[in-house]
């Protein structure tokens, strides 16, 4: 608010007032009269820059008059009372109401005193964020989408992620005239490492007290990535039975595990139990390449592991033997 002048009457009002589309707003405007100063006010006038005539007048004897009587109202001025408060209420704010307004006091003996107020017409946007489920493509694709609908002015959308990625933001007119819908896509080359990770869409707007944060959990569909664990290159005859595990990462989840060898079906000492393969004790050395084949909705992938059971030394080693 501008500081009052010294020794003179001054009109006090904010330089800018925000109002929401469709709502009502009060344009505050007061005459500040220093203690020793005497003033008499006979008229209050509101006019809009660029338009001919005044939109609202409060006259000392005639009372209030409005260019649009259903949309305007002096909130405090009353006939027979001192006219020091020219605050004007506007109902049913429209986009075209945005602009500069002059609040003016006709005073004696100072003459007229006025101030300009900028009315900002805002519309609070609705925000949504959603994952764009993708498959491995080898090139950048939208992986998340953030939409801020019906904002005025347009919302600002930014993305926050440790994964890199590039935003692609566009605007289209909103459903209500003068509003804007902003869509931002977060683009990255899909990989299995990204699946299940989070990115955050940050939406900023004049109407928000603080930015809105919307988290998106990324989804990348990919065929199984397979490895076999449980073998330490150190298996010997006479050691306990052992278990190999077929480790598969995939999205969607694996639908089937199939164990085999490079020679065909599993030998008798190997028993498949889903993702696990039980290796029973053997009484002679073996050298076999095992294959685990994992299937999901996108395809099948396999891993191979060559297992050797050697003649041998110390019984302290874990390994394969009959108890």
């Amino acid at each position: 608010w501008p500081p009052p002048g010294t020794g003179d009457v001054v009109v006090q009002a904010p330089t800018q007032v925000p109002g929401f589309l469709g709502d009502s707003v009060t344009l505050p405007c007061y005459l500040q009269v220093p203690n020793m100063e005497v003033t008499h006010v006979s008229q209050l006038t509101w006019a809009r820059h660029g338009e001919s005539g005044s939109m609202a007048v409060f006259h000392q004897t005639q009372g209030p008059s409005y260019s649009e009587s259903k949309r305007l109202e002096f909130v405090a001025a009353r006939l027979g009372a001192e006219l020091r408060n020219a605050s004007l209420r506007m109902f049913g704010l429209r986009v075209e109401d945005e602009g500069n307004y002059t609040c003016l006091f006709v005073t004696f003996p100072q003459g007229s005193r006025s101030v300009d107020i900028w009315l900002r017409v805002l519309a609070k946007p609705q925000n949504t964020a959603e994952v764009q489920k993708v498959q491995l493509t080898g090139e950048p694709v939208p992986m998340a989408r953030c939409v801020s609908t019906g904002g005025r002015p347009p919302a600002q959308i930014t993305w926050h992620s440790d994964l890199g990625g590039m935003p692609n933001t566009s605007q289209v007119p909103g459903f209500l005239s003068g509003t804007v819908t902003v869509t931002s896509l977060w683009i990255l080359v899909p990989s299995s490492q990204v699946d299940g990770k989070n990115v955050t869409c940050k939406v900023e707007h004049e109407s928000f007290e603080k930015p809105q944060l919307l988290t998106v959990n990324l989804t990348v569909y990919y065929p199984p990535e397979v490895s076999i664990s449980g073998y330490d290159n150190n298996w010997y005859l006479g050691q306990n039975e052992a278990t190999l595990t077929c480790d598969a990462r995939s999205n969607p989840e694996p639908t089937g595990y199939n164990w085999s060898t490079t020679m065909g079906p599993l030998p008798p000492f190997a028993v498949a139990q889903g993702a696990q393969l039980l290796i029973r004790p053997v009484d002679k050395p073996i050298n076999t390449t095992l294959i685990c084949n994992v299937t999901n909705a996108l395809g099948a992938r396999q891993a191979e592991l060559t297992v050797q059971v050697k003649e041998g030394p110390p019984s302290e080693h874990s390994g394969i033997s009959r108890n």
């Epitope: 005539g53 005044s54 003459g111």
Partner: antibody
């Protein structure tokens, strides 16, 4: 009913003074500023000055500064305009008018003639 | 001082005619303009305030418009009783000033 009733016509010699009165009724005298406007015969209107009855605060047209004095008597709800050092070009009808930014009520006018 | 230049200075029109009187201010006066009607031998009577608002009791054939420096008083359908002189006045700043008047005669 708002009424502003002015004193009668005056014939004055150049150099003399004239004091015109304006008695009001039908409204609260102290709530409205009272102004004086003059109109030479067949000519336009000229604002002289005004006074707020409550505070006694005045504002004068620079053209009359030093020659005009506007006063009020709150007890009788009457405003006065005194013009001194009269000259022939001061011959005009003098009106009191209630101020509402514009002037919504006027007295009937007082003809002041300055002639030797 | 702000000059108020009125035109025309005199005009005649017939009953039923649309009459327009203009007033030009030498500087911006916003909408702080009033219009008065003065019949012969009478004081002025307020018609319009704040450039476009009619005083109560004033017939709606009288209308005012304008802001800034250019103002208009319109009589939409002239009546015989509208024979008078019309003045504009600015009350944006002191000293208040008036137009020189437009004398309206009935043909």
């Amino acid at each position: 009913e708002v009424q502003l009733v002015q004193s009668g016509s005056e014939l004055k010699k150049p150099g003399a003074s004239v004091k015109v009165s304006c008695k009001t009724s039908g409204y609260t005298f102290t709530e409205y500023t009272m102004h004086w406007v003059r109109q030479p015969h067949g000519k336009g209107l000229e604002w002289i000055g005004g006074i707020h009855p409550n505070s006694g605060e005045t504002s004068y047209n620079q053209r009359f500064k030093g020659r005009v004095t506007i006063t009020v008597d709150k007890s009788t709800s009457t405003a006065y305009m005194e013009l001194s050092s009269l000259r022939s070009e001061d011959t005009a009808v003098y009106y009191c008018a209630r101020w509402t930014g514009d002037f919504d009520y006027w007295g009937q006018g007082t003809l002041v003639t300055v002639s030797s | 001082d702000i000059q108020m230049t009125q035109s025309p200075s005199a005009m005649s029109a017939s009953v039923g005619d649309r009459v327009t009187i203009t007033c030009k201010a030498s500087q911006n006066v916003g909408t702080n303009v009033a219009w008065y009607q003065q019949k012969p031998g009478q004081p002025p009577k307020a018609l319009i305030y704040s450039a476009s608002y009619r005083y109560s009791g004033v017939p709606d054939r009288f209308s005012g418009s304008g802001s800034g420096t250019d103002f208009t008083l319109t009589i939409s359908s002239l009546q015989a009783e509208d024979l008078a002189e019309y003045f504009c006045q600015q009350y944006e700043s002191y000293p208040y000033t008036f137009g020189q008047g437009t004398k309206l005669e009935i043909k």
